[in-house]
Each structure stands twice: as structure tokens, then as C-alpha cells.
Amino acid sequence: NQDLPVIKCVLINHKNNDSSVGKSSSYPMVSESPEDLGCALRPQSSGTVYEAAAVEVDVSASITLQVLVDAPGNISCLWVFKHSSLNCQPHFDLQNRGVVSMVILKMTETQAGEYLLFIQSEATNYTILFTVSIRNTLLYTLRRPYFRKMENQDALVCISESVPEPIVEWVLCDSQGESCKEESPAVVKKEEKVLHELFGTDIRCCARNELGRECTRLFTIDLNQTPQTTLPQLFLKVGEPLWIRCKAVHVNHGFGLTWELENKALEEGNYFEMSTYSTNRTMIRILFAFVSSVARNDTGYYTCSSSKHPSQSALVTIVEKGFINATNSSEDYEIDQYEEFCFSVRFKAYPQIRCTWTFSRKSFPCEQKGLDNGYSISKFCNHKHQPGEYIFHAENDDAQFTKMFTLNIRRKPQVLAEASASQASCFSDGYPLPSWTWKKCSDKSPNCTEEITEGVWNRKANRKVFGQWVSSSTLNMSEAIKGFLVKCCAYNSLGTSCETILLNSPGPFPFIQDN
């Protein structure tokens, strides 16, 4: 055993605002003193296996798992997590020890599990095992349900690893499209974990607890439906289970279904078939394709074929991390006072997002609707024609997204005036932003047509509450206009509004609205 290298396993906790944490699994700067994880040789294991002390991490914490190897010569390595191999770049420190690091940013439930590090040195090969779990803070969680096949039975079990224990229900629907909305009479709910009736058109499983309700739909290709223009797409994260159901109905039993991934038949343990006769004596067959824990190489086109139906495919994409894809550039809109208008954001995301619309520090519920092309859309129509800044915010386990909108309402200016001993000011929030004129009313100009250009100062300011622009114009008082009536007028393409002010000595000022 003297050939075995000296190995040290450490855990580095990063402060969450730590800019040094890299996005790769290379070697970020150490932000806190490393914690020794022991790394003892595991007895009775085939091969040389070192086991680090179990690591418990807070949700959203960022950590680095690090191995220091005191062995001569070069080393090569490979990380494996949930059957997926991850990049590994060893380097050497000042003491010439090999250093291998794995960075976990913003810890989530999906990143918990066993991390295996395989190291090959010139002398020997060995494995290091890290077990990472989320610290049991008494936080409630609600996890999206997933499916498992019931042992030795043609049935699906629905599982949601949530705290407190959720109520699990199957939501079944046998008609098409809109009539499968949640409260439709076509929808049947079964409050149980196991489902044997797997022939329905639309099958979802939902889990609910104090935090709300999360659902997962059984992804289905129906060969009796006309092939769609856009290929259905299914996203999954490494380690999640894959389930696709292929369904076909034919006048008799003389047809079979097959699954292929990139033109290769699925392996024996990755599919199972069920068939039944429907009420009108037609034969329904379903063929499930499943992978209990997906890896990157499960990505590809899954094609379901039948001798009696056109083949159809779905693109399955396995990602390391969830995402939200949408354009985050801010958008400005101007509408008329009674024009119907909705903000909308089109996005592609996995896992499904939680979202809110915010206006003037008030949040509004956010609904999302799936489109045929794999995108989803969220619309907000409840703006009540209030101008200002509207914010769409979305997040899932791994990503966040914010988009800003500005709504301007086209309207004639409304003028408010105020005055002090030295100046008079007028304000307007019409849109487009108004231009200003000041006029003096005198014996020579009883209709107030004598324009004042001296001492006028115009500006636009952002009224913070709603994020809407207010235009103002200030007239500095001079001896020439003291004691006179002056008129400030705001005008834009929709009209003009004026206010008349008597510039007398300090004291209350009468204002005469003049539209």
C-alpha cells in the first residue's frame, strides 16, 4: 500500500457575493478557510476508493469540493455525477501537489448527490467519493413531480420529493385541446400515487402542499394526430427521468409500435408496451420510452414508428442546468387612452418558471401559456391604462430573468401650476411630452397673446412612483411681469391645456384653469 498517494479532500464555502467563484469546475480563489473532509480509504471496496466526509450545504450556497494529491508525475481525472461525466482540469499548487476542484454554484436539490472523482496517476488509479446533501433547514419545498414505473406492473408511480409531504393526484383528460383545461367537465382527478389507466389523451400528475401546486405532463406523441409543423421538444436536466409515451389507435390489432433514438432501436430495458381495445373495438397501443436517470448522451431525436401510421419524432435535449431564454431588452409602448393592449413576453424555459408582473411596487399574478413551437408566453393586460414602468420577473431553480416595459398613454396635457415669490411653475404629464409657451396678459394683450421668452426654464423629470415622465416649465419673475396675469400652456399632438396665474406679491396665488 506504500504506492498509494497522500490525498487530502477539502470543502471550501464561498460567500454568496463572492465574485471569485468561477463558473467552471476549475479553481476559484479561496474565500474562507478550507474544511478538511478526511478522505479515508473505504474498506471492502473493489478498487481503491477514498470516501470524504459527508457534506451538508445550505440551499443557494456556493461551494468547491477540492482534492489535493501528493503523488509524483502527471494526473488525469474525470468527475461523474448522476451518470454524467463532467469536465475536470487538474493543476499543481506551489507545493507541487495535484489540485482538482468541482465548483457548485447556488446549491439546489438537483445538485445534491454523489460526486465521483476518478484519478489516474502514473503509479495507480483511484476513486474519491463525495456525498453532498442540502442541509435540513426547516424550509418547505415543493418539487415538480416525476414518474417511475411500478415494479412488475404496467403502471406509473408519481413522486414529488416535497416537504411537507404533498398530496399527489393524477389529472386525466380524454378530449383534445381547450376542453382539457383544469376545471373542464372532461377532466377527471384521482388522488392517488399509482396510475394503471395509461391510455388517456392527456395525463398529468400534480403535487400540492402549503407552498402551492406543481404539475408534470406525461409527454405524449399521438400518431393519430396529423404531424405538426414544429417538432415537439422536451428538455430535461442530467439525472432526471425521461418518459415519452407513443400512442396509436387502429381498426385492428395488426400494427406494432417501435421507438428509435437517432435511428437506433431503444435497448430492451428502456421501453414497455401496453394495449387495449376501446369501446368501439378499435385497438389502442401505447409504447413508453423511459430512462431512469438521463445523461448527456440521451439527447437526440426520439422517433415512434408504426406500420399503419406516419412516424413522428420529438427532440429531447438534456441540459446540465436549467435556463430561461428570452430577449431581455426593455420595450416601450405608446397607446391611446382606450386602446386595448397587453404586454407579452415569449420565452423558452426549463424547468417551468414562476413569474410575476410588477407595477408601482405592486405584484400581479402571472399566467403562462404553452405555444406549439416549444415557447411559452406570458401576457399582462391589467394595466388599467396607467402609464409607467412594468416589470416581468421569472425564475426557476437555476435561472432568473427580468424584463422592463414602459407604457405611455397618449393624451392631451393636463396642467397644474404653483408659484412662489420669485417664480411660477407649471407641470404636465400628457404624452407625447408637451412643449411649453408662456404668455403675458395686459391691457395691450387682453387675450394673452404677448409671448414671454425670457426667464423660462423647461425640464422633464421622472416621477418615481409610476416611472412616468412629467414635464415642467418654470418662469422666473422679473419686474416686467410682476402684478400681471400670465398664462402657461402645454401642448402636444393631442391638444393644448393652459393655466392662468396672477403674479402678485408673495402670498396665495389664484390659478385659473383654462382649457
Epitope: S305, S311, L315
Partner: nanobody, 111 residues
Framework: QVQLQESGGGLVQAGGSLRLSCEAS????????IDWYRQAPGKQREWVAQ???????FYADSVKGRFAVSRDNAKNTVYLQMNSLKPEDTAVYYC?????WGQGTQVTVSS
Amino acid sequence: QVQLQESGGGLVQAGGSLRLSCEASGPTFSINYIDWYRQAPGKQREWVAQITRDSNSFYADSVKGRFAVSRDNAKNTVYLQMNSLKPEDTAVYYCRVLSYWGQGTQVTVSS
């Protein structure tokens, strides 16, 4: 990446015939089946026909009995034979493999 190129479109009188071709290049070994679609002006793209690797063919109800799809594996080409053409068959015709589409070929049927 599979590339697809349609050809054979043109102007034809009602009742006439046309044969469209769809030539595939790139990793054609990965082609399990090829679909034909069409898009008439101002309408959604609709599925027309499919031919599988085993030369099984399937058709939309609107073209059944008039259109026939075939393939020549040696030339990596699929054909859509269109007979008894009607003005409502006027459209741009596309072939598709999985997520890959051709540029389309225009078919105009005059009455």
C-alpha cells in the same frame, strides 16, 4: 446537419400532373422518414405525405388517391408525384426531415 433541396415545381393546369423531388445531403443515414408539407398563401403549413425508410407511405385525406410518394435510396431522393391537380393544391411545397426543412418549391395550379 441534413440539407434538403426541393425541385420540380411550376405552373400547371387543373387536372394536370407534376413530380416534385427532394434531394437530401449530409448525414442521410440518419433519415428514418421524410415528410412533405405545403403552405398556401395566407394559410398554415400543412402535412401532405410521408415515406418511411421501409417505403411505407402515408397521406393527408385531401390528397389521398391523387398523390404518390416514392424514394430512390441510391440518389438520396424522395419524389412526390401529384396527379389530378386542383387549384386548391396551389402552394409552396416543402420536404422535411426531423427539424430540417428545404427551401420549398412553388406549385401553381390554374383553373
